[in-house]
Amino acid sequence: DCDIEGKDGKQYESVLMVSIDQLLDSMKEIGSNCLNNEFNFFKRHLCDDNKEGMFLFRAARKLRQFLKMNSTGDFDLHLLKVSEGTTILLNCTGKKVKGRKPAALGEPQPTKSLEENKSLKEQKKLNDSCFLKRLLQKIKTCWNKILMGTKEH
């Protein structure tokens, strides 16, 4: 159960939205190379009516897997702000999230030639970037939905 705090939007607009926008701004060029395929995460986790808290809780958890993936400290700092800030504002209690180490972002690849490995690594990096951008966009949309009280009825 999540008792969403700060529904007036002050904390969201002054901290979270600033960081989300900074992150999205730094990822402006990502998108044109992204495949059209739907990521499994978004098939399963939707910012649906009455499930906004659940979506944001899992999205914030997923964001943590991207920490240290990007070389710049600023990027990581903003990611951390969005992840931690979302979790704090959600104020979720009694979450039955089974103890488990975070799943690796990419699947392990069989041994391949150096050239193939380089290509696979580049594709995986692009895939992760596409996913992260989409995740941030959906987190922003979901927060806006909560704060504006817009219900898709």
């Epitope: 399963r44 939707l46 649906d48 499930k51 799943a103 009825h153």
Partner: antibody, heavy 117, light 111 residues
Framework: QVQLVESGGGVVQPGRSLRLSCAAS????????VHWVRQAPGKGLEWLAA???????DYNSAFSSRFTISRDNSKNTLYLQMNSLRAEDTAVYYC???????????WGQGTLVTVSS | DIQMTQSPSSLSASVGDRVTITCKAS??????????INWYQQKPGKAPKLLIY???NVEFGVPARFSGSGSGTDFTLTISSLQPEDFATYYC?????????FGGGTKVEIK
């Protein structure tokens, strides 16, 4: 409120084709994945296919060679093109809106397809 | 494909009874700390209705007497106190791996 209405069912001869439609209302159709699920008379449920917001598709491999899912967001409509129909395709065909956990959160009333000579 | 084995296939119960339906998957339905199993109720001539999603989450508007539990391959749908409107067929469905698959159903009849 969310509403899904299937149409296009009826009696068809084996080997022929049929296109089912599902008209959606009461929600932003383009923002959700949608599925086709069928149920043969007196039998259980069988997932056929899904189409996602960006247009990518997932199929049950048992049907991917004969069935094609598509959507027209401008018309808020989902389609299922069924080719080379067989007697065993006789069933009620439901469209369903994707829900949390890739569940089927909302269902249409279903449309009956009877394949018979 | 993941096989979903539901038991029993049918049961007779009285109003007020506690009813338990089980579903066993041929492989684990757990991923990232969540269980990808959903439960539905279907009445004759009607479309199925979502009751429980992701193992234990009760769908909005569904009475609190319905609950879901389990992890890995073994899952349970419980109706704490059966009501007259609960006589129906119940299905489990896994969404961990494509193709999405359903259990064979459990028909709950009046004793």
């Amino acid at each position: 409120q969310v509403q899904l209405v299937e149409s296009g069912g009826g009696v068809v001869q084996p080997g022929r084709s049929l296109r089912l439609s599902c008209a959606a209302s009461g929600f932003t159709f383009s923002s959700y994945g949608v599925h086709w699920v069928r149920q043969a008379p007196g039998k259980g449920l069988e997932w056929l296919a899904a189409i996602w917001t960006g247009g990518s598709t997932d199929y049950n491999s048992a049907f991917s060679s004969r069935f094609t899912i598509s959507r027209d967001n401008s018309k808020n409509t989902l389609y299922l093109q069924m080719n080379s129909l067989r007697a065993e395709d006789t069933a009620v065909y439901y469209c369903a809106r994707n829900g949390y956990g890739e569940s089927f959160a909302y269902w249409g009333q279903g449309t009956l397809v009877t394949v018979s000579s | 494909d993941i096989q979903m084995t539901q038991s029993p296939s049918s049961l007779s119960a009285s109003v007020g009874d506690r009813v338990t339906i089980t579903c066993k998957a041929s492989e684990s339905l757990d991923h990232d700390g969540d269980s990808y199993i959903n439960w539905y109720q279907q009445k004759p001539g009607k479309a199925p209705k979502l009751l429980i999603y992701m193992g234990s989450n009760v769908e909005f508007g569904v009475p609190a007497r319905f609950s879901g539990s389990g992890s890995g391959t073994d899952f349970t749908l419980t109706i704490s106190s059966l009501q007259p409107e609960d006589f129906a067929t119940y299905y489990c469905q896994q969404s961990n791996v494509d193709p999405l698959t359903f259990g064979g159903g459990t028909k709950v009849e009046i004793k």
